[in-house]
């Protein structure tokens, strides 16, 4: 025989048991709530910090690019690729046709103060895109020069100069004193490159990587 | 709906499910204990075997806390 | 951790919590049912009141399905 418990002890035991069980329930629910809150609040803070980062990134560009035109990349709402508003975009880059006329050095400086470089043309497709925005009676500096006058052409961004991906007009380059490259239109050959004196003012084309925010 | 939004909706559903199940589990546990006590009182100790056996069952369960 | 990753991790925690609690709840429910049957057999019908009363308690609980 089990010694019989007093009814009040049993009630007390039941009360303690209930307290323990409900305490466990409360703790569990609190933990769940913490999880859920973290799940809701942290992403919000994450979004907030991301927005702050974006804003500071935008502020960097604001001096020269007061407004950006952005497009959503892929399906994720988080990824936007932007170009400064008057610029045009192609693949992962933004392009700007500078109609002001400057020497090659000044043209490069002008691009650099806008966070860009004189254009580096890597493919025929890129050139075909660029020429859509050019005027036939103008010449435009490229980011291509031969500083030593020894026909060691180099791109401003240090991209290796590949003879196989060049679009020189026939007979060009033709003068060791002409150390900078332009793109211009010749009725016989359409658009192509020519070497000219660097100090003669020309229009120019700037290129920069898209701004990802 | 975007992928992140879907994740938050799922979070909410699982959260509510967790709360409801926690409450149900605790309620059942208490009802079982109450039933055991009631059973003990009604039997007047004649069938102590039954009372003890049930008690053991409940004791075993009592120590199984839901994972935190 | 990135925003989506965090959401998925929390999803996983809540999901596991839900599964564990569901299993515990079902186990408790089954044990309660077994205990009721054992209790009924052992009493030989002498104290049918006890059996019936507990049965009622279990019946009530049995119909409370966890929300899906």
């Amino acid at each position: 025989m089990v010694p019989e418990e007093e009814p009040q002890d049993r009630e007390k035991g039941l009360w303690w048991f209930q307290l323990k069980v409900w305490s466990m329930a409360v703790v569990s629910i609190l933990l769940l709530s913490v999880c859920f809150t973290v799940s809701s609040v942290v992403p919000h803070n994450f979004m907030y910090s991301k927005t702050v980062k974006r804003l500071s990134k935008l502020r960097e560009y604001q001096q020269y690019h007061p407004s950006l035109t952005c497009v959503m990349e892929g399906k994720d709402i988080e990824d936007w690729s932007c170009c400064p508003t008057p610029w045009t975009s192609f693949q992962s880059s933004c392009y700007f046709i500078s109609t002001g006329m400057q020497s090659w050095t000044k043209s490069q400086k002008n691009c650099s103060v806008m966070g860009a470089d004189l254009v580096v043309i890597n493919t025929r497709e890129e050139q075909d895109f660029i020429i859509q925005n050019l005027k036939r009676n103008s010449s435009y500096f490229l980011g291509l020069s031969d500083p030593g006058g020894r026909r060691h052409w180099q791109w401003v961004d240090q991209t290796p100069y590949n003879e196989n991906v060049t679009f020189w007009h026939s007979g060009e380059p033709n003068n060791l004193d002409e150390r900078c490259a332009i793109i211009n239109f010749r009725s016989s050959e359409e658009w192509g490159w020519n070497d000219i004196h660097c100090h003669v003012p020309q229009k120019s084309i700037c290129k920069m990587k898209k701004i990802y925010i | 709906l975007g992928e992140p939004q879907l994740c938050y909706i799922l979070d909410a559903i699982l959260f509510l499910y967790g709360i409801v199940l926690t409450l149900l589990y605790c309620r059942l546990k208490i009802q079982v204990r109450k039933a055991a006590i009631t059973s003990y009182e009604k039997s007047d100790g004649v069938y102590t075997g039954l009372s003890t056996r049930n008690q053991e069952t409940y004791e075993t369960l009592k120590h199984e806390k839901p994972p935190q | 951790l990135g925003e989506p990753q965090l959401c998925y991790i929390l999803d996983a925690i809540l999901f596991l919590y839900g599964i564990v609690l569901t299993l515990l709840y079902c186990r408790l429910k089954i044990q309660v049912r077994k205990a009721a049957i054992t209790s009924y057999e052992k009493s030989d019908g002498v104290y049918t009141g006890l059996s019936t009363r507990n049965q009622e308690t279990y019946e009530t609980l049995k119909h409370e399905k966890p929300p899906q």
């Epitope: 020497s103 660097c198 100090h199 | - | -």
Partner: antibody, heavy 120, light 107 residues
């Protein structure tokens, strides 16, 4: 040493055309640089009018765009200024100047200038 | 076009004095500024280019300074041959515009 010399009529009637010649010695105008016309009004204000580059391309100041033409004769190593429909406002001393020195940082070579008066 | 504002329009000074002429651009010209001296009936002569580099044969008493939109030409210990007109001209972007000039006279 490079030398530039302007020449042309000193008096032009309103509505007529002003034509000036710049003769360059000591450097071929097809070898490099760009060759400017700059004028100085009676109040001393200076204005760049336009240029012809060593490769024959032109630039004209937008304020003169419809009236100005700069051409060259490579065989004579000369370049020319033509300004149509002149008014008394075009009275000035006209200089021919070589551009592009010091990586296009300053005009180092100027002609001595020729005064053109527009008057009836 | 970038506008160049030169001051003062005229200046009287004595031999041996130091004078400063200033030039303000309507936009950043990135140090692409030249200074010229012009004597009566002559063509302008380049003194300074790229804001601070002296042209060939220019005496060291001339010095240029400044950045962005504000530039100045300083003449230490004025000599009699320094009197005349002075002009600034920016070389940042075509058209290259000139300042209005400063007439430096003997006091």
């Amino acid at each position: 040493d490079v030398q530039l010399q302007e020449s042309g009529p000193g008096l032009v009637k309103p509505s007529q055309s002003l034509s000036l010649t710049c003769s360059v010695t000591g450097y071929s105008i097809t070898s490099g640089y760009y060759w400017n016309w700059i004028r100085q009004f009676p109040g001393n204000k200076l204005e760049c009018m336009g240029y012809i580059s060593y490769d024959g391309s032109n630039y004209y100041n937008p304020s003169l765009k419809n009236r100005i033409s700069i051409t060259r004769d490579t065989s004579k190593n000369q370049f020319f200024l033509s300004l149509n429909s002149v008014t008394t406002e075009d009275t000035a001393t006209y200089f021919c100047v070589r551009g592009g020195d010091y990586d296009d940082g300053g005009f180092a070579y100027w002609g001595q200038g020729t005064l053109v008066t527009v008057s009836a | 076009d970038i506008q160049m504002t030169q001051s003062p329009a005229s200046l009287s000074a004595s031999v041996g004095e130091t004078v400063t002429i200033t030039c303000r651009a309507s936009g950043n010209i990135h140090n692409y500024l030249a200074w010229y001296q012009q004597k009566q009936g002559k063509s302008p002569q380049l003194l300074v280019y790229n804001a601070k580099t002296l042209a060939d044969g220019v005496p060291s008493r001339f010095s240029g300074s400044g950045s962005e939109t504000q530039y100045s030409l300083k003449i230490n210990s004025l000599q009699p041959e320094d009197f005349g007109n002075y002009f600034c001209q920016h070389f940042w972007i075509i058209p290259y515009t000139f300042g209005g000039g400063t007439k430096l006279e003997i006091k």
